[in-house]
């Protein structure tokens, strides 16, 4: 069976390879050879065996979330949502699929990663690739010029994911965006403040937020001698500088993208620089860069941004990095990306390589792409890479062997003797009606030891024990699972006592 599964995977991989070679217009001989290999692999699967036992698995790049993982996820979401709300954001939702036309031409080289849906009767549809383009469509469609919103939802990318590093084909994004005409850099600074607040609250390790500006990049490319048509493709090369050496980036720009070596060297002098506000000031004095209108605007805005970031108390977390060239076509101004400096791995362990954990920027032209009159709505926003954060938190908890509660049950209604099911059902109902999170075991006569064991395993802190004598006395025995201490509580005081012990507010308002 394992051999068959391996062969099936090889057939799939070889099929992808053949398709890739055809797309790249590889030599006819190479394609012919790889097709012949594919046919030989298929022949080894056998004629009718393809109708063999269906392998139960989730599709490539997706995963199920176990209760434990969901508990982690909800904690992470809670931190993020509380921060978004603290900053006054409203919440919206949009369809998981959009008209294909809506997404086309918005993502540059990444467009190939969009999932197209099979024709469903006329409309050409695609799964959303991010939450930003649907947000811009929402603004244009509803003629909104001013909103501060957050949106947490799944997005889809036909990536080849390295799932061990927290990358998937279906994953959550948590976006916060401010749309509207405001004074320069105030909303941008708030977005960076939010990013820092969230990453600090999540306690996933030290981080750095790299900041740059699309106008500085474009201005720099212009003065270095890059033609307009090559800006975007050179951007995507420069953006790899956090992963590979300058030599490799230069080779790609010269060898694959046809840039002259001297132009690449001029770019290299700039993009290898990073620092703080002093670098902004240094570049404002740069004889060539300061002569470029776009770059000058960008540098001026960054200087202002650093002033606000200092007032927000986060300037120590920010680095002006000229190699940051985020790969999305729609950015027009400030761009930023948060990276973990090192994850809290145990001493001697390899730090987790999860890369960027949050990113964003200004995209003043995107809404205008959807408006018939091209009316622009300036926007700035950020996206938290929660899947990567889930991976880090999960691995950290595993390393610490920390037990995570997957339910919020406060009390188990138990009985010490037989024939007390009716009494347990009455009591658990009273507790539910009073807003207490309660459970009981679905057995007529459960053993007390089994009930206590269930509490231990599920992390339930309290047990309300009913017995013949307690019923006569009008009391319930309330037992703490950890300390094993028991007290008799009058039935009418039980709700209040449970709330007191579990720190729940006394009224469910």
């Amino acid at each position: 069976m394992a051999e068959r599964a391996a062969l099936e995977e090889l057939v799939k991989l070889q099929g992808e390879r053949v398709r890739g070679l055809k797309q790249q217009k590889a030599s006819a001989e190479l394609i012919e050879e790889e097709v012949a290999k594919l046919l030989k692999l298929k022949a080894q699967l056998g004629p009718d065996e393809s109708k063999q036992k269906f392998v139960l698995k989730t599709p490539k790049g997706t995963r199920d979330y176990s209760p434990r993982q969901m508990a982690v996820r909800e904690k992470v979401f809670d931190v993020i949502i509380r921060c978004f709300k603290r900053h006054g954001a409203e919440v919206i939702d949009t369809p998981v699929f959009e008209l294909k036309e809506t997404l086309m031409g918005k993502y540059g080289e990444d467009s190939k990663l969009i999932y197209d849906l099979k024709d469903q009767g006329g409309e050409l549809l695609s799964l959303r690739y991010d939450l930003t383009v649907p947000f811009a469509r929402y603004l244009a469609m509803n003629k909104l010029t001013n909103i501060k919103r957050y949106h947490i939802a799944k997005v889809y990318r036909r990536d080849n994911p390295a799932m061990t590093r927290g990358r998937y084909r279906e994953f959550y994004q948590c976006d916060f965006d401010i749309a509207g005409n405001f004074d320069p850099m105030i909303p941008d600074a708030e977005c960076l403040k939010i990013m820092c607040e969230i990453l600090s609250s999540l306690q996933i390790g030290d981080f750095l937020v790299k900041v740059n500006d699309r106008r500085i990049l474009d201005g720099m490319f212009a003065i270095c001698g890059v033609s307009d048509s090559k800006f975007r493709t050179i951007c995507s090369s420069v953006d790899k500088l956090d992963k590979v050496s300058w030599e490799e980036v230069k080779n790609e720009m010269v060898g694959e993208k046809g840039l002259a070596p001297e132009v690449a060297d001029r770019i290299g002098d700039y993009v290898q620089q990073h620092g703080g506000v002093s670098l902004v000031e240094q570049l404002l004095q740069d004889p060539k860069l300061s002569q470029n209108k776009q770059a000058l605007e960008g540098l001026g805005d960054l200087k202002l941004l650093f002033e606000y970031l200092t007032l927000f108390g986060i300037d120590d977390k920010i680095s002006f990095d000229l190699s940051l060239a985020r790969g999305l076509d729609y950015y027009t101004g400030v761009i930023y990306e948060a990276v973990l400096l090192q994850t809290p791995a145990q001493a001697g362990e390899e730090p987790l390589g999860v890369g960027s954990v949050a990113a964003g920027g200004r995209y003043d032209g995107l809404v205008g792409m959807f408006d018939p009159k091209g009316r622009k709505v300036p926007c700035v926003g950020l996206s938290i890479g929660v899947e990567r954060i889930f991976s880090i938190v999960e691995q950290r908890l595993e390393a610490l062997e920390e037990k995570i509660r997957t339910t919020e049950t406060q009390v188990l209604v138990a009985s010490a003797q037989k024939k007390l099911l009716e009494e347990r059902l009455k009591l658990v109902s009273e507790l539910w009606d009073a807003g207490i999170k309660a459970e009981l075991l679905y057995k007529k006569n459960p053993k007390l030891l089994n009930q206590l064991q269930y509490c231990e395993e599920a992390g339930i802190p309290l047990v309300a024990i009913i017995g013949e004598q307690e019923l006569k006395d009008g009391v319930i025995k309330l037992r703490s699972v950890t300390s094993r201490e028991e007290v008799d509580v009058r039935r009418e005081d039980l709700v209040e006592e449970i709330k007191r012990r579990t720190g729940q507010p006394l009224c469910i308002c």
Partner: antibody, heavy 120, light 107 residues
Framework: QVQLVESGGGLVKPGGSLRLSCAAS????????MSWIRQAPGKGLEWVSY????????KYTDKVRGRFTISRDNAKNSLYLQMNSLRAEDTAVYYC?????????????WGQGTLVTVSS | DIQMTQSPSSVSASVGDRVTITCRAS??????LAWFQQKPGKAPKLLIF???NLESGVPSRFSGSGSGTDFTLTISSLQPEDFATYYC?????????FGQGTKLEIK
Amino acid sequence: QVQLVESGGGLVKPGGSLRLSCAASGFTFSDYYMSWIRQAPGKGLEWVSYISDSSRYTKYTDKVRGRFTISRDNAKNSLYLQMNSLRAEDTAVYYCARYLYQVIAIADAWGQGTLVTVSS
Amino acid sequence: DIQMTQSPSSVSASVGDRVTITCRASQGISSWLAWFQQKPGKAPKLLIFVASNLESGVPSRFSGSGSGTDFTLTISSLQPEDFATYYCQQAESFPYTFGQGTKLEIK
């Protein structure tokens, strides 16, 4: 069981020639792509050349192209590597290896290797 | 040519330890990666193919993961016979290249 046995290695002077052979048994030789992989003393592995099941496709690394020729005789269940204009840097243990699932460039069966020493 | 970089180049560990070796490709290779074990004076032995498939007869303490450019070989609980040199190899495009090797030594 699958068996690959190389022969033909030895000491040769720079510029000289050698012909390596590999005798295969325990599987249907004519169904499989085959390859030569070498390992210089104390060094890592290097894929030298491969040949398809029917000899239609052959490839060589840049280092040996034009000097080495891979061939096979399916009737004799044998694989060969003709090495000409040998250089000191060709000194290595040469392994004959079979492709995984007939066509996948991952060696799932290897010979014991034959040592080629190029020295004056 | 696709460059394969293994890390660490050598690692010392004890019987029962969990060991992880990583392999990085200079460009994306999908899942076209294999792991081999080689003992002194012997031919390499295939352990894992297409990133995560265990070759038949290989103990289940060996596992592989990864896709694209980053791959991992994990030995969950080292046995005395596991001390050897481990190589990764890309099978994405010719010339098929190996990593420089990781020597696993007894601590």
